[in-house]
Amino acid sequence: QEGKFSGPLKPMTFSIYEGQEPSQIIFQFKANPPAVTFELTGETDNIFVIEREGLLYYNRALDRETRSTHNLQVAALDANGIIVEGPVPITIKVKDINDNRPTFLQSKYEGSVRQNSRPGKPFLYVNATDLDDPATPNGQLYYQIVIQLPMINNVMYFQINNKTGAISLTREGSQELNPAKNPSYNLVISVKDMGGQSENSFSDTTSVDIIVTENIWKAPKPVEMVENSTDPHPIKITQVRWNDPGAQYSLVDKEKLPRFPFSIDQEGDIYVTQPLDREEKDAYVFYAVAKDEYGKPLSYPLEIHVKVKDINDNPPTCPSPVTVFEVQENERLGNSIGTLTAHDRDEENTANSFLNYRIVEQTPKLPMDGLFLIQTYAGMLQLAKQSLKKQDTPQYNLTIEVSDKDFKTLCFVQINVIDINDQIPIFEKSDYGNLTLAEDTNIGSTILTIQATDADEPFTGSSKILYHIIKGDSEGRLGVDTDPHTNTGYVIIKKPLDFETAAVSNIVFKAENPEPLVFGVKYNASSFAKFTLIVTDVNEAPQFSQHVFQAKVSEDVAIGTKVGNVTAKDPEGLDISYSLRGDTRGWLKIDHVTGEIFSVAPLDREAGSPYRVQVVATEVGGSSLSSVSEFHLILMDVNDNPPRLAKDYTGLFFCHPLSAPGSLIFEATDDDQHLFRGPHFTFSLGSGSLQNDWEVSKINGTHARLSTRHTEFEEREYVVLIRINDGGRPPLEGIVSLPVTFCSCVEGSCFRPAGHQTGIPTVGM
């Protein structure tokens, strides 16, 4: 019957387990005349066969590790051997069985870790491979620490990422590792396939030797320094310390300032050497460097941030000794005459620079005082009372008080009453012809002079001409400056010209007065002129399609996964070569041709997300010009950190002898992201031998209670191992130790004879 094992020729996919001897046919294809036979091509490997009647089968066991997918094609042929149907793709997917064991790439690994390194930050990776399919449990590897030597107080100082093989310090390791006490450790690491979840999994082991080194070289917190300090200088503001004595400290001014007001002494103490002025510079970023006796840096420089805090040490300043405005005779009440804009050098958007305006005097007071008003915060002057008469009073002088919260300044404004504006500007030429310029012509260059005239009262806003480009320059690449004496317009380049987007621009100018025209008079064609700008090509650097490219991937993506891509185009159409800059963690590589970005190492959200690198696009050939953009890789969390204790629980005690069973509460955490509901840990005792003495019960997702099962405990310290499972995907488990001391008590505290004061427990239960 047609169906599962027979039917017409069409694209099909079949899944077959590797390692199985053939037991049945794969499919029987049915021919439609004139087709009479079938032909098989593609990745047959002499395993797959089709009989002339269309019976597809395989003749020996498959091996996924040799070929995971066989891409075959089946065609139906007529009696002349001519293809009359197909060829259609037939895909054989070889399903994996666990027929390969994981193997470590090295039988011994060596590494070092600095004391107090961040918990969870990998300092060494062990790596095993398994030829089985990583998309199935058969190839999913699970790393575990089998033993840590030495094991002090049953506390694990090291942890391994079960999935990635990344070895890092536990919280306890970060706090307690001390090279003076124990400079080296050995770990035995196992790797299992089947995600570590099956009795039938294969495994391998390796040895890891770890050297512990000291580290106190850390950037201090940002410093805030109030400007204009009157304290005696130098003033110590912060400090850095190298791990070993004898380092030579120096500061590097990355901004190359003419005056660098900071110093460092040979202890690593950092000073400000003179009062700072926020108005000169509001923040400093510089580096502290530690060098050896030969002047060679001992490590990366530390970034020092100093922010200068503002005080109100600047009064408002007037824009000019006298600010001149004009008002036409026929202006209406409320019309804007102009805006007085005073300045204050103190910090913007603070009370120190917030200004108020007030008119304190008008002269002459004709025909009356109070002809003008000023908006308190905006500084805009308006006509307040009546239209003015030039023949009566051609000029008014105002004194305006401008104040911040501590200072007052007087500014002077002259208001000239001018004739009505009843003449329009007239261009001397309506067409200024063609002008050819290279696209790299300097910004600020004057490229054309234009001229219009206006018959209104000279040197007033009615005859002053302002030129505007009203057409042909939507990008705002050009501007026109006006000579106030001659009304000549100078056309200048304001933004770079661009051959690629605007090779020819038909520019239209409009000549206008700053003063409004009287009612009934309008600008006409005489106030307009045109010219044509022709731009010629110059080689330019490539242009990225975005300033910042952003991508988002899971932190556990396989090495070699495409994590994003960038695109740039060369304005001249040259090919582009991409490269990366600032890949400090060595996580990424970029395809020089396509701009696709791939991972080349395990990623770690806990090491910091987003991860920022620069991408460089360089012309191939030509002048090899290049441009830079940013690539931000946002790492999404996976469950790759086992649970641990939320804090240090050393010092737990019960008073001996116990009068009744007691209990204590502890809290767990882990470094993975817990959105919305928070962690949901489960708790159990770490070994069966503890069951007789102890009991652990869950309180909520993060807290549990450890209780004694009886009162017959010896007067000594017990280390209780507790297994914490995070219930994630995959679930990760941490084994933590709670040290609990049973001791004689005096007034509810542990009593120890003199000479036994080390590690006194401080928490009674």
Epitope: P33, P34, V36, R52, D78, A79, N80, G81, I82
Partner: antibody, heavy 123, light 107 residues
Framework: QVQLVQSGAEVKKPGSSVKVSCKVS????????IHWMKQRPGQGLEWIGY????????QYNEKFKGKVTLTADKSTSTAYMELSSLRSEDTAVYLC????????????????WGQGTTVTVSS | DIVMTQSQKFMSTTVGDRVNITCKAS??????VAWYQQKPGQSPKLLIY???NRYTGVPDRFTGSGSGTDFTLTITNMQSKDLADYFC?????????FGGGTKLEIK
Amino acid sequence: QVQLVQSGAEVKKPGSSVKVSCKVSGYTFTDHTIHWMKQRPGQGLEWIGYIYPRDVITQYNEKFKGKVTLTADKSTSTAYMELSSLRSEDTAVYLCARWGYFYGSRSYYFDYWGQGTTVTVSS
Amino acid sequence: DIVMTQSQKFMSTTVGDRVNITCKASQNVGTAVAWYQQKPGQSPKLLIYSASNRYTGVPDRFTGSGSGTDFTLTITNMQSKDLADYFCQQYSSYPWTFGGGTKLEIK
């Protein structure tokens, strides 16, 4: 050795029919297709169609559909071409040929030909 | 239908010459082309198949070349016994078609 022997020349009246035979020997008749071609004096060859004796599958050139019927007799290893409603433009030499392909081979060619049969249509 | 065009109906040649007989297909036929020789009063004989493969027993002075739409049969060192009609044929798609033929003659 492989041979294709065609029947002798025919003179026919317009409107009548004629059946030309092509007897093969030297190979298994059902393994190969037999094709028929028309050749008029001083002109090229025209492909009429083929028959596959094994499954009695035929395929015709659209131009000859309704004009030609191809049949085969497996018992005598003979292929036949019948021309109906004869007209003067059917006057030609008709050739049978064996197509060399058989299952699993790559022999895409006419490797053996009959000697040709002349059909003359005249009133 | 695919039209096979042999643009030269007749070609004059001399013994010892190198002769190129061309055939152009009206659309792409890949390499599904055969060449046949036919002498007066005889049936055609296969020379070349799959555009460039010489059939068993055919002298090596006959060679075929080309793919897609342009094909050539080359006879190097022309012999008098090679005077005949030469046909190309496509079997890429039905109906199969032949070229009109090129007849070789002595100059």
